[in-house]
């Protein structure tokens, strides 16, 4: 029935590899969207939430046209590594209020890891450097309260959703240019 999850088929066609990365990104976007909606239902958000440790969004309205594949893949991989760290932290330190979402957070983490492996493979196929994050990694302390962990979850899922939407846009456009 095909290769096991996380082991992409062997291909020397960068367009096919990129296509596969786009589809995984869209799949993760769907999961993130669903989980964010669940969060809003269970713990209604009072406005927008932010977290200083999250990466800043990689793009503004004007930058799509000038995107280059190496830059998009490198930035996406670095940002997703940060989101992976934040999801792991949420699962570890989120407290009892987020325990009900543990299966979904676990599945989200697995999908994130799978996408990161796919991006790493794509970058190695394209002979791109596996860049390390620019800034030093700031340790994530425990949330100040139960409400703090809920606010953090809203911020993480919201930021990941925007990052993935941006990534799908960029990757789709780049694929048409290959």
């Amino acid at each position: 029935p095909g290769p096991p999850a996380g082991s992409p088929r062997v291909s020397s066609d960068p367009r096919a590899d990129l296509d596969s990365a786009v589809l995984l990104t869209r799949s993760l976007l769907a999961d993130t969207r669903q989980l964010a909606a669940q969060m809003r239902d269970k713990f209604p958000a009072d406005g927008d939430h932010s977290l200083d440790s999250l990466p800043t969004l990689a793009m503004s309205a004007g930058t799509l046209g000038s995107l280059q594949l190496p830059g998009v893949l490198t930035r996406l991989r670095v940002d997703l590594m940060s989101y992976l760290r934040h999801v792991q932290w949420l699962r570890r330190a989120g407290g009892p209020s987020l325990k009900t979402l543990e299966p979904e957070l676990g599945a989200l983490q697995a999908r994130l890891e799978r996408l990161l492996r796919r991006l790493q493979l794509l970058m190695s196929r394209l002979a791109l450097p596996q860049a390390a994050p620019d800034q030093p990694v700031i340790p994530l302390g425990p949330p100040a309260s139960a409400w703090g962990s809920i606010r953090a979850a809203h911020a993480i899922l919201g930021g990941l959703h925007l990052t993935l939407d941006w990534a799908v846009r960029g990757l789709l456009l780049l694929k048409t240019r290959l």
Partner: antibody, heavy 119, light 111 residues
């Protein structure tokens, strides 16, 4: 009730531009992207482009790149599509539709705006 | 671009009959666990209305007599027992890739 309400019909001369608005209500505007679709008489529906209300960053059907411009006004929960250098083939009904890039189907549609290009 | 071909172009049936509409894609639109095909209904002077998403999921508020099936390149919309209000034009749409495209439509008419 989730609704998309579009601006009224337009008649334009060849070479002119038209800007159509689409006002969203009944849902959180930033939670969905806005897509635009063209339906010319006797032709199949044609996707024009998609915009994310939070980050902007529209993507376009290559056929419309350079002539279509998608924008949003977040504070007014309104999306806009401007089409420039109009020609007779642009005579059509234009729809805004609520979408998202994960699965990319359109679950809520505006009522449509008829644009007629005629000299 | 992926081309979607719908058949038949028109179909004349009576209320109570079963309708089977076909949509064929020029390349596979199924991958990563999803079939990226969606079905819409459009009546004259109205906007399209989503019926089925991701090949087989019934949109909220759509009657259960509508169903979708298929994978890869061949998809089907079935209306199990036609009602008067079902006579309209039906479009399939893919979202596998950029740009999403639509089929040319199947017009369902009363016999």
């Amino acid at each position: 009730e989730v609704q998309l309400v579009q601006s009224g019909a337009e008649v334009k001369k060849p070479g002119a531009s038209v800007k159509i608005s689409c006002k969203a209500s009944g849902y959180t505007f930033r939670d969905y992207n806005m897509d635009w679709v063209k339906q010319a008489p006797g032709q199949r529906l044609e996707w024009i482009g998609d915009i994310n209300p939070t980050i902007g960053a529209p993507i376009y059907n290559q056929k419309f790149t350079g002539r279509a411009t998608l924008t949003v006004d977040k504070s007014a929960s309104t999306a806009y599509m401007e089409l420039s250098s109009l020609r007779s083939e642009d005579t059509a009904v234009y729809y805004c539709a609520r979408g998202e890039l994960a699965h990319w189907y359109f679950d809520v549609w505006g009522q449509g705006t008829t644009v007629t290009v005629s000299s | 671009d992926i081309v979607l071909t719908q058949s038949p172009a028109s179909l004349a049936l009576s209320p109570g009959e079963r309708a089977t509409l076909s949509c064929r894609a020029s390349k596979s639109v199924s991958t990563e666990g999803y079939s990226y095909i969606h079905w819409y209904q459009q009546k004259p002077g109205q906007a399209p209305r989503l019926l089925i998403y991701l090949a087989s999921n019934l949109e909220s508020g759509v009657p259960a007599r509508f169903s979708g099936s298929g994978s890869g390149t061949d998809f089907t919309l079935t209306i199990s027992s036609l009602e008067e209000e079902d006579f309209a034009t039906y479009y399939c749409q893919h979202s596998r890739d950029l740009p999403p495209t639509f089929g040319q439509g199947t017009k369902l008419e009363i016999k």
